[in-house]
Interface confidence: low
């Protein structure tokens, strides 16, 4: 048993252009809090799968209100550590997700509103009892700086917190089967759970009798540094202090194996032993499974029935593609009738209807003339989604309310003179012309 501890140092805009606006404003003051989720192994599971190693929620930070015009600073943080107790062995390799949440303190109905500002994730190797490890992670334009460590809770000790050290009942030597627990000489250690001789600094175990190595160490007891072979290497100059040959550059130097693969030298070159889920010469190829959370947009991931189809994504409505990564252009099906404008809002389709039409798909043709009166004897004509008045002679305008001057448009051709008349207009034609509009 033990505790994983996380100390958040800062959360604020990252370097470079596109710095985010402050998440809080004078109108909406807010405060931050953090959630950490731990999972065993080097899986990159979806954030919503169980935090099998444990999870913790920080206290709320101080209330922050943006100062208008000022650049977004690092935001005030909650006090204290985030502590995730673990009851079983510390696995040595783990995945973490750290979420930064904003609590808005405005006048929301039903209390404060929460929203996720940033989520960072990573995969790490970490021995319990070691020093604080520092990290910087970026999520979009935000930057999170933090440190973490795993420590064992007494009586557990060791890199996996699997060795039990019991306080001595008396200052005499430890009882049968027990030996002093270095460096705590006033405690006694229970019989080892790991394989006898497994390096307490570089090895750990999750099952009795095994010895698993931390990164950089190899051998059955994790006592051999990776890429060196002690004094057996013929390369390099002799060391005055040990009399051993100091290894020169070898094919495994710098560990060419990616994704946690371990490197071993071969007569010609090197060979990578890849962790589960990776393959290729340098373990650079990922065999994606559902554990990697490959289905986007809420897609449902189902493990495939055979190795060639490691997973299948069942996409929710509105998404398609092997990873549900493509939004279906539902407007391409032209669901809006009568010239309505289609809007795909993601969670739903909306049709913006032209005047005179209504309904979810603009399928209802409204009676354009309903309740519309045309004045001065005009008659209403439906069409095109809007009403139109056909006005009686001498009247015009949208509702036939305007008195029309029939001569205003100069309807009489070839210099004919126009006279307004109760029944319309009369043209007095110039000599040599005739017709109602003097057109002949």
């Amino acid at each position: 048993a033990g505790v994983f501890e996380l100390q958040i140092h800062s959360f604020g805009p990252g370097p470079g252009p596109g710095a985010p606006r402050s998440p809080c404003s004078a109108r909406l003051p807010c405060r931050l809090f953090f959630r950490v989720c731990l999972k065993p192994g080097l899986s990159e599971e979806a954030a919503e799968s169980p935090c099998a190693l444990g999870a913790a929620l920080s206290a709320r930070g101080p209330v922050y209100t943006e100062q208008p015009g000022a650049p977004a600073p690092d935001l005030p943080l909650p006090d204290g550590l985030l502590q995730v107790p673990f009851r079983d062995a510390w696995p040595g390799t783990f995945s973490f997700i750290i979420e930064t949440w904003r609590e808005e303190l405005g006048d929301q109905i039903g209390g404060p509103a929460w929203s996720l500002l940033a989520r960072v994730a990573g995969r790490r190797r970490l021995a319990a009892g070691g020093p604080w490890a520092r990290d910087i992670q970026r999520a979009g334009a935000w930057e999170l700086r933090f440190s973490y460590r795993a420590r064992c809770e007494p009586p557990a000790v060791g890199t996996a917190c699997t060795r039990l050290c019991r306080p001595r009942s008396a200052p005499s030597r430890c009882g049968p089967g027990l030996r002093p627990c270095a460096p705590l000489e006033d405690e006694c250690e229970a019989p080892l759970v790991c394989r006898a001789g497994c390096s307490p600094e570089h090895g750990f175990c999750e099952q009795p009798g095994e010895c698993r190595c931390l990164e950089g160490w190899t051998g059955p007891l994790c006592t051999v540094p990776v890429s060196t072979s002690s004094c057996l290497s013929p390369r390099g100059p002799s060391s005055a202090t040990t009399g051993c040959l100091v290894p020169g550059p070898g094919p495994c130097d710098g560990n060419p194996c990616a994704n946690g693969g371990s490197c071993s030298e071969t007569p010609r070159s090197f060979e990578c032993t890849c962790p589960r889920g990776f393959y290729g010469l340098r373990c650079e190829v990922s065999g994606v499974t559902c554990a990697d959370g490959p289905c986007f947009n809420g897609g449902l991931c189902v493990g495939g029935a055979d190795p060639d189809s490691a997973y299948i994504c069942h996409c929710p409505p509105g998404f398609q593609g092997s990873n549900c990564e493509k939004r279906v252009d539902r407007c391409s099906l032209q669901p809006c009738r009568n010239g309505g404008l289609c809007l795909d809002l993601g969670h739903a389709l909306r049709c913006r209807c032209r005047a005179g039409f209504a309904g979810p798909r603009c399928e209802h043709d409204l009676d354009d003339c309903a309740g519309r009166a045309c004045a001065n004897g005009g008659t209403c004509v439906e069409g095109g989604g809007a009403h139109r008045c056909s006005c009686a002679l001498g009247f015009g305008g949208r509702d036939c309310r305007e008195r029309a001057d029939p001569c205003a448009a100069r309807p009489c051709a070839h210099g004919g003179r126009c006279y307004a008349h109760f029944s319309g207009l009369v043209c007095a034609c110039a000599p040599g012309y005739m017709g109602a509009r003097c057109e002949f």
């Epitope: 979806a46 499974t289 495939g304």
Partner: antibody, heavy 119, light 107 residues
């Protein structure tokens, strides 16, 4: 077609042991969470344990911790629940279910096997 | 452990009714909430995952929503085959926990 078939249930005395099996077909259990969920007569659902065989990782409900052990044999595509020190309150129908990853709902369930602990 | 408090514990409704069942989590559980339907003598069936996503093959009259730590299952128009017991379940934090169930009976 995905299928889960439980077996191994039966009548056992308090303090006794039983081993339940969950044989899976139509998918590979090594890349799935495998759960055991139980339901006492006339009661609601209670999650018991899960295993993620790829990493051998297990998790248990407090009520069974130290008494029950979940395991898997990926070569047989089968998950197991070893139940020791059984008590009367462990009497229930035990279901095996497959858990999804992205959402962690349990999308496929077995038909259940009844475990009765009684003297 | 996270408690999932489900209400009501039972309700009577008629065919065609709109039915709403709620679940409140004792702390934030992200959207990792699922809803199940169970009929007597049968295994539960997944209806909703990730709080609001409809599982494939489930009729569209079922829907799920989330507001903070409150989760809701809605049946828009109850059908004869919908009379059953419904459970919510959270999977954001270990241990996984279920609500105590809501029995939907015929009025």
């Amino acid at each position: 077609e995905v299928q889960l078939v439980e077996s191994g249930g039966g009548l056992v005395q308090p303090g006794g042991s039983l081993r339940l099996s969950c044989a899976a077909s139509g998918f590979n259990i090594s890349s799935s969470y495998m759960h055991w969920v139980r339901q006492a007569p006339g009661k609601g659902l209670e999650w018991v344990a899960y295993i993620y065989p790829s990493y051998g990782y297990t998790s248990y409900a407090d009520s069974v911790k130290g008494r029950f052990t979940i395991s898997a044999d990926t070569s047989k595509n089968t998950a197991y629940l070893q139940m020791n020190s059984l008590r009367a309150e462990d009497t229930a129908v035990y279901y095996c279910a497959r858990g999804g990853y992205y959402y962690h709902g349990m999308d496929y369930w077995g038909q259940g096997t009844l475990v009765t602990v009684s003297s | 452990d996270i408690q999932m408090t489900q209400s009501p514990s039972s309700l009577s409704a008629s065919v065609g009714d709109r039915v709403t069942i709620t679940c409140r989590a004792s702390q934030s559980v992200s959207s990792a909430v699922a809803w199940y339907q169970q009929k007597p003598g049968k295994a539960p069936k997944l209806l909703i995952y990730s709080a609001s996503s409809l599982y494939s093959g489930v009729p569209s009259r079922f829907s799920g929503s989330r507001s903070g730590t409150d989760f809701t299952l809605t049946i828009s128009s109850l059908q004869p085959e919908d009379f059953a017991t419904y459970y919510c379940q959270q999977a954001s934090w270990s241990p996984i926990t279920f609500g105590q169930g809501t029995k939907v009976e015929i009025k």
